[in-house]
C-alpha cells in the first residue's frame, strides 16, 4: 500500500480494508487479521464480530465488512443486526421469564416468537364468528347474523390445522 496524501487530511485517500496508520507516518496499512474497515479514511480498523455460543455465522468477516450472525436452530434474532438470540416457542405459546407458556384462553400466537394476542372481536365489526379461535389461530369472522339465511349456524367446527409457520390469509 503506497503512502498517499491529500491537501486536507492525509488519511482521506486510504480505501476501505485499510487504515491510516499513526505508527507509520499515516500510510495506508491493510487491516490486521480479524478486523475490517468498511469506509475509507479510517484511522483504525474495527474488530470483527464473533458469532459464538447461540449465535452462528451467517456471513464471514472480510477486510471491508463485519461478520453477520444469526441464531442456532431453536432460537431467533432480536434487535438491530441480530444483537440477541431469543428462544423459540411452539405456536400457541409465548416466552415468559419462566419459559414457554401456553396462550391463555381468548388469545393466540401463530408464530414461534412474539406474544399471545387476543382473538379478534367479530362483533365490533358487526360480524359473527365463523370459525372458533384456538391457541394457535385467530377466530375467523363471517357475515353479520342478519346476513345469514334462516336456520344457518354462525359457528362451524374448527378448521383443520394448517402447516406450522403459515398464518391465515
Amino acid at each position: 500500500f503506497e503512502r498517499t496524501r491529500s491537501l486536507q487530511d492525509p488519511c482521506s485517500n486510504c480505501p476501505a480494508g485499510t487504515f491510516c496508520d499513526n505508527n507509520r507516518n499515516q500510510i495506508c496499512s491493510p487491516c490486521p487479521p480479524n478486523s475490517f474497515s468498511s469506509a475509507g479514511g479510517q484511522r483504525t480498523c474495527d474488530i470483527c464480530r464473533q458469532c459464538k455460543g447461540v449465535f452462528r455465522t451467517r456471513k464471514e468477516c472480510s477486510s471491508t465488512s463485519n461478520a453477520e450472525c444469526d441464531c442456532t436452530p431453536g432460537f431467533h434474532c432480536l434487535g438491530a443486526g441480530c444483537s440477541m438470540c431469543e428462544q423459540d416457542c411452539k405456536q400457541g405459546q409465548e416466552l415468559t421469564k419462566k419459559g414457554c407458556k401456553d396462550c391463555c384462553f381468548g388469545t393466540f400466537n401463530d408464530q414461534k416468537r412474539g406474544i399471545c394476542r387476543p382473538w379478534t372481536n367479530c362483533s365490533l365489526d358487526g360480524k359473527s364468528v365463523l370459525v372458533n379461535g384456538t391457541k394457535e389461530r385467530d377466530v375467523v369472522c363471517g357475515p353479520s347474523p342478519a346476513d345469514l339465511s334462516p336456520g344457518a349456524s354462525s359457528v362451524t367446527p374448527p378448521a383443520p390445522a394448517r402447516e406450522p409457520g403459515h398464518s391465515p390469509q
Epitope: 496508520d21 499513526n22 505508527n23 490486521p32 478486523s35 483504525t44 480498523c45
Partner: antibody, heavy 120, light 107 residues
C-alpha cells in the same frame, strides 16, 4: 496469557547508560507494537516511543529522541530501551507496554515497571 | 503535542457512589481516547478504548463517553477495589500523550 516481564530495579551512575529489558510471552511478539512509558515519582505518564518487532520500525517522542534507543531481540522475544547519559531527571519507573490490535492506539498490557535510580 | 488535562487531581467518594472523572484535550481527538487504572502498587490496567469500549474483563460499572475535546470515565457503583489513580491517553496523533491523572480516594 500475555505477560511483559521487567526487572524490578536498576541503579545507574550519572553520565553512563542503562539498557532496560522487557521479556514478552503469551502472544505473537512480532505482531504487536511495544511502547515505553516513563513515570516520575508521584507524577503522570510520558510516552517515550514504540517499536514494531517484525520490522523494527520505531517512533520516538521528540523529547526522548536523542537519548532513548529502542531495539528488540526476536529470538528471545525481548524488547530493550537504552537510555544514554542519564541524569537525576531520569530517575523514574519505566513501563514497557503492548499496543493492542487492531490499532485504537491504546496499550492493552503493561509490564510491572522497572524503577531506575540515577545516583552516584 | 496534544495536551490532555484532568482538571481534578484527586477525588473523594463513598462506596456505592457514582463517580465521574473528566479529561479535556487541547484539540479534537475524534474519540481516540483511552482510560487506564493505576493501583497504589504501580500496577496498570487497561479499562476503556476508543472513548466508550470496555476492554475484555473490565466490570460493566465502568463506562466512558465524550466526543471532540471533552471525555469522561464513569464508575457507576464505587467498590473498594476501584481505589486507584485514573489516566486518560490520546491515540489520535503522535506523540501519544497522557492526562495528569485523577486519584480516587474513599471518604
Amino acid at each position: 496469557q500475555v505477560q511483559l516481564q521487567q526487572p524490578g530495579a536498576e541503579l545507574v551512575r550519572p553520565g553512563t547508560s542503562v539498557k532496560l529489558s522487557c521479556k514478552a510471552s503469551g502472544y505473537t511478539f512480532t505482531s504487536y507494537w511495544i511502547n515505553w512509558v516513563k513515570q516520575r515519582p508521584g507524577q503522570g505518564l510520558e510516552w517515550i516511543g514504540n517499536i514494531y518487532p517484525s520490522d523494527t520500525y520505531t517512533n520516538y517522542n521528540q523529547k526522548f529522541k536523542d537519548r532513548a534507543t529502542l531495539t528488540v531481540d526476536k529470538s528471545s522475544t525481548t524488547a530493550y530501551m537504552q537510555l544514554s547519559s542519564p541524569t537525576s531527571e531520569d530517575s523514574a519507573v519505566y513501563y514497557c507496554t503492548r499496543m493492542g490490535d487492531p490499532f485504537y492506539y491504546a496499550v492493552d498490557y503493561w509490564g510491572q515497571g522497572t524503577s531506575v535510580t540515577v545516583s552516584s | 503535542d496534544i495536551q490532555l488535562t484532568q482538571t481534578t487531581s484527586s477525588l473523594s467518594a463513598s462506596l456505592g457512589d457514582r463517580v465521574t472523572i473528566s479529561c479535556r484535550a487541547s484539540q479534537d481527538i475524534s474519540n481516540y481516547l483511552n482510560w487506564y487504572q493505576q493501583k497504589p502498587d504501580g500496577t496498570v490496567k487497561f479499562l476503556i478504548y476508543y472513548t466508550s469500549r470496555l476492554h475484555s474483563g473490565v466490570p460493566s460499572r465502568f463506562s466512558g463517553s465524550g466526543s471532540g475535546t471533552d471525555y469522561s470515565l464513569t464508575i457507576s457503583n464505587l467498590e473498594q477495589e476501584d481505589i486507584a489513580t485514573y489516566f486518560c491517553q490520546q491515540g489520535h496523533t503522535l506523540p501519544y500523550t497522557f492526562g495528569g491523572g485523577t486519584k480516587l480516594e474513599i471518604k
